[in-house]
Amino acid sequence: LSTGVSFFFLSFHISNLQFNSSLEDPSTDYYQELQRDISEMFLQIYKQGGFLGLSNIKFRPG
Amino acid sequence: SVVVQLTLAFREGTINVHDVETQFNQYKTEAASRYNLTISDVSVSDVPFPFSAQSGAG
């Protein structure tokens, strides 16, 4: 069964940011700003035609 | 630090797992200057199909 889409799980650390409880709440400014920056960054990195997007962003303490 | 976990979606056949990781790693310096994000410990793996069917691509 082929969907025509490949999915990759990606994990990384951001060492110059501190985790706090607002990163567990998608309604907070801190969460939304970080999510926006990360989404924008991935659009920059994978500029080639095959990139479809990202989903399931989760933040955890490092 | 903050650990970020996410799922990336690509058109099938357009990129292999090695290039997903390499292209991300090569962008780390720019991420630091443009977004003030210091990135380390990058890990990439492919998502088995049954999981990816549920997760969709936003």
């Epitope: 080639q48 035609g49 | 292999n16 090569q26 492919d46």
Partner: antibody, heavy 120, light 107 residues
Amino acid sequence: QVQLVQSGAEVKKPGASVKVSCKASGYTFTTYTMHWIKQAPGQGLEWIGYINPGSDYTHYNQKFKDKATLTADKSASTAYMELYSLRSEDTAVYYCARQGNYAAYYFDYWGQGTLVTVSS
Amino acid sequence: DIQMTQSPSSLSASVGDRVTITCRASGNIHNFLVWYQQKPGKSPKLLVYNAKTLTDGVPSRFSGSGSGTQYTLTISSLQPEDVATYYCQNFWNVPFTFGSGTKLEIK
């Protein structure tokens, strides 16, 4: 037309080093990744690593990371592979091979091969 | 590392025969599978990429198939000029490993 022309055969003593060249023509050298492959006499193919001549980014097969160094000279459109601390098991034909461009996961052009013989 | 197990290691067939070479990967390589043909004393030549796409100039008697971990190269009607060693290659993840090769001869 695309061509990859490699340097000639070499005979080296154990412990010596050798530098093999791969001169590219017929395409824009910096936009294609160059890989190196080993083939010992009568044996199969073994991937050594690659260099992206545009960024000088390299990636090695762990097995070869202390054996080979890959470089590229953009102005000469030439890729190089230097092999160190040669031993008899390094005797092989070494190929350079171009990886196809965006989303092209294959080697579309190969050099003619360079035989490196290690013998005392 | 992904191991590529190719079979058979050698094969003798008659002109006109249908010939099948198999390559098994130790993990899912998502169709990032390449086939090369190498004639004695020559450099390998690209035959098939993305498991089933025939490269320009390769005769239509060659075809590739498979998915996941299991891949096949088929020659529908063997010709004398097909005498060579055939290699599969994983292009999913580094190291980009090759199969050990299948030496094809004419009976």
